[in-house]
Interface confidence: medium
């Protein structure tokens, strides 16, 4: 049975600033015909037929659900892209993470401006801070890492706060063992 394709993002963030670029790639096993990809944005078929969909100089209208399909294979699971205009944007490698998988958080400044005194918060409590900007790496996510995250920081000497982001860590499905 052919596998469902999977949409991946490069850079890996599904929350980006207006004007930024992101490439969506339709990955799957044994898809030899690279020009036979269908892309759907908010349910509408896109003109793009390559296995990669480039979003250049993102606009608010680029927000929404993206799916891809190779030949007769099932559509991929949807990926949701959000385009923002703000001073700070908290980005996550994924908003729903399987337990044991890595999770990366990034406090991203508008126009890639430097952000100083970056503080990451989880459920209203300071999680970690640096005087310069750093990403947060959680190597093995646990259910306890679920929560509402946001970051604060200084841009051009003024203090700003990102919109909150909900992260959910779900338990990995248990393997079934049968008695022989």
């Amino acid at each position: 049975v052919p596998q469902k394709p999977k949409v991946s993002l490069n850079p890996p963030w599904n929350r980006i600033f207006k004007g930024e670029n992101v490439t969506l790639t339709c990955n799957g096993n044994n898809f030899f015909e690279v020009s036979s990809t269908k892309w759907f944005h908010n349910g509408s078929l896109s003109e793009e037929t390559n296995s990669s969909l480039n979003i250049v100089n993102a606009k608010f209208e680029d927000s929404g659900e993206y799916k891809c399909q190779h030949q007769q294979v099932n559509e991929s699971e949807p990926v949701y892209l959000e385009v923002f205009s703000d001073w700070l944007l908290l980005q996550a490698s994924a908003e729903v993470v399987m337990e044991g998988q890595p999770l990366f958080l990034r406090c991203h400044g508008w126009r890639n401006w430097d952000v100083y005194k970056v503080i990451y918060y989880k459920d209203g409590e300071a999680l970690k801070y640096w005087y310069e900007n750093h990403n947060i790496s959680i190597t093995n996510a646990t259910v306890e890492d679920s929560g509402t995250y946001y970051c604060t920081g200084k841009v051009w000497q003024l203090d700003y706060e990102s919109e909150p982001l909900n992260i959910t860590v779900i338990k990995a499905p248990r393997e079934k063992y049968w008695l022989q």
């Epitope: 503080i119 409590e125 300071a126 970690k128 005087y131 310069e132």
Partner: antibody
Amino acid sequence: EVQLVQSGAEVKKSGESLKISCKGFGYRFTSYWIGWVRQMPGKGLEWMGIIYPGDSDTRYSPSFQGQVTISADKSISTAYLQWSSLKASDTAMYYCAKDNPFTGSFDIWGLGTMVTVSS
Amino acid sequence: QSALTQPRSVSGSPGQSVTISCTGTSNDVGGYTYVSWYQQHPGKAPKLMIYDVSKRPSGVPDRFSGSKSGNTASLTISGLQAEDEADYYCSSYAGSYTWVFGGGTKLTVL
């Protein structure tokens, strides 16, 4: 009241090991970096290194890298500074200090631990 | 990572003003606003007097002020008082979560 309480004075011989402590009170210990500062007799302050007790992220001054180990036990709100083999030149007062991201400085200091190493 | 440069000693009479300089590089003092000043009386722990170049923590008299120009920060104490006699250290963030202190300045109130 926010305070850092350091362990008592130590007298040691060259080659011995030592671990001194700094316990935080009155604030969320895991959420602030703790720095260590050396002051040799009659000399100035030297920044040694710093630890974030929440995840044990640690940074060292190049001058102290490999000479000391900074660690923390967040379950008892305590940071540590340790030596595996002391030298006479380690004789000094050692201070721990709490970093404050809102002031960009060390706002709370321990009273210091005097370490005396005889050869 | 060299120590910041401070004068070894300064002195002044009660009521006068004194200024202590602290010279670093563009990698520390010149590169960040995170410059602090600490006061240390003999046998005591250092005490924060100025942070973020020029801000005073609550409880610190407004006779203490800080400034910065390029790679040099300054601490000015006006209306000098006997209890101001102490050692003063500047400190700067130096990037990647490292700090550097100055060599210290002994202030004598004549």
